[in-house]
């Protein structure tokens, strides 16, 4: 027989020879980090066919690291479901707890003994410090000094000293989240008031209000013979400006001989051919829209309108 087979878990006792005679026996022992559990044989014999009788290293078992208990409020999860050396142990904490220590331990061989690469971690309860205080507002549970996981606080704005209330910008409720960090930034309390939206040759059709505060929504339509340039719906944003800007109502052009206009006073279009003119002075033709450069207010239109001159 030629050289006997080699194995992952056991090694030949003595030096291998190039050739073995029929009937000759070789013995194996478990490699370092493995141990023998009877009764399986750990030897083989060169038989008459010049082949070695079947043998396996199933009798040699890997050394295993000591059993690790689940950490309190967490779990120890052996990779590949085994504690044998060369493998890893993963640690995870239950929701509302966070890991202090190593997330992964390695089962390592020290001499002939398998031991873990470090101390098992612990799972500590997620705690948050009090959330930020905000100007012109407050939050619930302001007297609490330590917050647990998923504890929530809700912000509200103080009464304003003037005629206009403070608006809450952002989410009113935040909660103590993973990593002891609040779920989002604290909201802001400030006066948000948009100007009265003036639309020449049109009018507001919904969202009527005494004043227009944060998130106020207004809709417009144009008079007959005018079409909407811009969005028919605008919202008061946190900067006290209308978003999108207040639309304009522009005069529908008289039909040309070649192609009649496909626009009605209720059609919303966007035009790329016009550029706002600066505020004009002096007499102006009555069909031109009144002049305004105020943000969100009507501006005169060049191009289409001037082509009527």
């Amino acid at each position: 027989c030629e050289e006997p087979p080699t194995f992952e878990a056991m090694e030949l006792i003595g030096k291998p020879k190039p050739y073995y005679e029929i009937g000759e026996r070789v013995d194996y022992k478990c490699k370092k980090g493995y141990f023998y559990i009877p009764p399986l044989a750990t030897h083989t014999i060169c038989d008459r066919n010049h082949t070695w009788l079947p043998v396996s290293d199933d009798a040699c078992y890997r050394e295993t690291c000591p059993y690790i208990r689940d950490p309190l409020n967490g779990q120890a999860v052996p990779a590949n479901g085994t504690y044998e050396f060369g493998y890893q142990m993963h640690f995870i904490c239950n929701e509302g707890y966070y890991l202090i220590g190593e997330e992964i331990l390695y089962c390592e061989l020290k001499g002939s003994v398998a031991i873990w690469s470090g101390k098992p971690p612990i799972c500590e309860k997620v705690l948050c410090t009090p959330p930020p205080k905000i100007k012109n507002g407050k939050h619930t549970f302001s007297e609490v000094e330590v917050f647990e996981y998923l504890d929530a606080v809700t912000y509200s704005c103080d009464p304003a000293p003037g005629p206009d209330p403070f608006s809450l910008i952002g989410e009113s409720t935040i909660y103590c989240g993973d990593n002891s960090v609040w779920s989002r930034a604290a909201p802001e309390c400030k006066v948000v008031k948009c100007r009265f939206p003036v639309v020449e040759n049109g009018k507001q059709i919904s969202g009527f209000g005494k004043k227009f505060y944060y998130k106020a929504t207004v809709m417009f339509e144009c008079d007959k013979g005018f079409y909407l340039d811009g969005s028919d719906t605008i919202v008061c944003d946190s900067n006290s400006t209308w978003d999108p800007p207040v639309p304009k109502c522009l005069k529908v052009l008289p039909p040309s001989s070649t192609k009649p206009p496909a626009l009605s006073h209720s059609v919303s279009t966007s035009s790329t051919t016009k550029s706002p003119a600066s505020s004009a002075s002096g007499p102006r033709p009555t069909y031109k829209p009144p002049v305004s450069n105020y943000p969100g207010y009507p501006k005169p239109e060049e191009g289409i309108l001037d082509s009527l001159d």
Epitope: K193, R195, F196, V198, V199, E200, N201, K203, Q204, F208, K210, K211, S279, P290, V291, S292, N293, Y294, P295, Y297, K299
Partner: antibody, heavy 118, light 107 residues
Amino acid sequence: EVQLVESGGGLVQPGGSLRLSCAASGGSVSSYDISWIRQSPSRGLEWLGVIWTDGGTNYNSAFMSRFTISRDDSKNTAYLQMNSLKTEDTAVYYCERVYDGYPWFAYWGQGTLVTVSS
Amino acid sequence: AIQLTQSPSSLSASVGDRVTITCRALQGISNYLNWYQQKPGKAPKLLIYYTSSLHSGVPSRFSGSGSGTEFTLTISSLQPDDFATYYCQQYIKLPWTFGQGTKVEIK
């Protein structure tokens, strides 16, 4: 609190021109939206137009071809330029500070009388 | 332009009376209506904005109501200082327009 004082009124012949001034004291005219309103026994109160803080304007279309509103920030004054005056333009002319961007006329000047007569 | 019609054009009342002035719009103006008071030789003064909101410094005997096309200014108990002319004004649509006025005189 800003005070508005109108001036420039007087007697003018039909077809003539006149420029009314609205001087602001105690505040900057450019910080406010200024409207011009006139009043006559025959026509009552009529809103003429507005100049916004950025210098943009809106007009009552009935007067748009003859009246122009402007502002000179260095003089802290708003103006109403009136051309081609008619006898029916005879009225007391007021400048007024629009209330905080809303069309509520809360702060009026004392008014200046314009008489158009031959 | 949106036309506003006030009624009555004038009325006579005594101190302590309850006085009601009506302003009608030819088309709906939501609540976009203001009321002004004017005394002879003076500029008008804002009394009420947005139909029913009292302007600062205006006595609580003044109140406003209505919506759409019909609006009312009420003086609950007329005082000597209240004898004046009253105007309504709409601002839903340019040009902003005024009513013709209602003169409240001493009976």
